[in-house]
Interface confidence: medium
């Protein structure tokens, strides 16, 4: 070994060392949350990027740049830091038009913490190891979700609209001449039954233990579907998005309430299925595969 | 599909009554309101009288008094009762519906359905 790469590996295995970049990335993020830095902050950045070029220069001495099995670029937590220090130099000395975009990649230094912190650096890869591993998983659970939202398209298909129209109409006024004025909220709220504090009109149902409209509205399907359209099973893509919903449990119980009252209460059972099936055993599964996945990384 | 039929239609002598009935087939699933609207020759389609789900009912200015609409809910039949005709009562009396049906593919749908009409004329 010539000199100077006996010297630079003294440098990288040292305590010390580790210690002045992990000091600099944490100085480096304190300075990156400032709001408007002040002008001398400038020549602070390039004491960082010098830092960076330093640590990287040792490590390339040191190890090799990517000829060989344990060299700098054959380490893909190198690749991070690599890609840090093209972007500094990148964002400093080319003018590339749109700088604030490029600048953005400097949050990437942040990222380094990862690779200087053992535990950090453990979890990380035991992240990454599990998104591997979770890819059978995921093909099972997206075709889960798949067969349900087929079920739930199949059964719920245009319930959602179903509501509660007023029947005391004006001598000359149709339902066809109303849907044609229908334009803002307060004109649907003429028209439709609301209850308090509701910002989507009562929904109804046509089967006997569906909701029933109070006295002087009739169930009609019409209008557009609840939460300003966007909750349906209308399409294949709007009940997947609503059993994803149930899947992960986000305010789920809205969902299973509309629908009953749309659809009947019988339908209840298609809930639980999915319910059990997909948010206790399907989410379970997936933690279970990280968590293998990250004992297999500790040891 | 929906259909709307108008019968009950015929001659009558001024001061005389008639009974029209609109019944509605097909899937239906329930029927909003109802009414009954005429035309006369030469002249633009009018409203007569209107019941809604709930059984109220309204009136054009010109039959008050004399027409009274009806309906029975089980048969998805609305029946104008017609006293006191006038020879300006003549025209082709429509009925006109809110009806929301199961149609093919067992989709609903919701929309105002038409009869053909049936003929009313008052002379003497």
């Known amino acids: 070994f010539s000199p100077l790469r006996r010297i630079s590996i003294k440098i990288l295995v040292h305590s010390l060392f580790s210690m002045l970049i992990m000091c600099t990335i944490l100085t480096n993020c304190i300075f990156m949350t400032m709001n408007n830095p002040p002008d001398w902050t400038k020549n602070v950045e390039y004491t960082f990027t010098g830092i960076y070029t330093f640590e990287s220069l040792v490590k390339i001495l040191a190890r090799g740049f990517c000829v060989g099995e344990f060299t700098f670029l054959r380490d893909p937590w190198n690749w991070l830091d690599f890609v840090v220090i093209v972007f500094a130099y990148l964002t400093e000395f080319v003018n590339l038009g749109n700088v604030s975009a490029l600048r953005t990649f400097r949050v990437l230094r942040a990222l380094k913490t990862i690779s200087v912190i053992p535990g950090l650096k453990t979890i990380v890869g035991a992240l990454i190891q599990s998104v591997k591993k979770l890819s059978d998983v995921m093909i099972l659970t997206v075709f889960c979700l798949s067969v349900f939202a087929l079920i739930g398209l199949q059964l719920f298909m245009g319930n959602l609209k179903h509501k509660c129209f007023r029947n005391s109409l004006e001598n000359n006024e149709t339902l066809e001449s109303i849907m044609n004025t229908l334009e803002s909220e307060e004109d649907f709220r003429k028209y439709f039954y609301y209850l308090e504090g509701s910002k989507d009109a009562l929904l109804c149902g046509f089967s006997t233990d569906s909701g029933q409209c109070p006295e002087g509205y009739t169930c009609v399907k019409i209008g557009r579907n609840p939460d300003y359209g966007y909750t349906s099973f209308d399409t294949f893509s709007w009940a997947f998005l609503a059993l994803f919903r149930l899947m992960t449990q986000d305010y789920w119980e809205n969902l299973y309430q509309q629908t009953l009252r749309a659809a009947g209460k019988t339908y209840m059972i298609f809930f639980v299925v999915v319910i059990f099936l997909g948010s206790f055993y399907l989410i379970n599964l997936i933690l279970a595969v990280v968590a293998m996945a990250y004992e297999e990384q500790n040891q | 599909e929906v259909q709307l039929v108008e019968s009950g239609g015929g001659v009558v002598q001024p001061g005389g009554s008639l009974r029209l009935s609109c019944a509605a087939s097909g899937r239906i699933l329930r029927i909003g309101y109802m009414r009954w609207y005429r035309q006369a020759p030469g002249k633009q389609r009018e409203f007569v009288a209107r019941i809604t789900g709930g059984s109220a009912t309204g009136y054009a200015d010109s039959v008050k008094g004399r027409f009274t609409i009806s309906r029975d809910q089980a048969k998805n039949t609305v029946y104008l009762q017609m006293n006191s005709l006038r020879p300006e009562d003549t025209a082709l009396y429509y009925c006109?519906?809110?009806?929301?049906?199961?149609?093919?593919?067992?989709?609903?749908?919701?929309?105002?359905?038409w009869g053909q009409g049936t003929l009313v004329t008052v002379s003497s």
């Open positions: 006109e519906a809110l009806v929301t049906a199961s149609v093919r593919g067992g989709s609903i749908h919701s929309g105002t359905y």
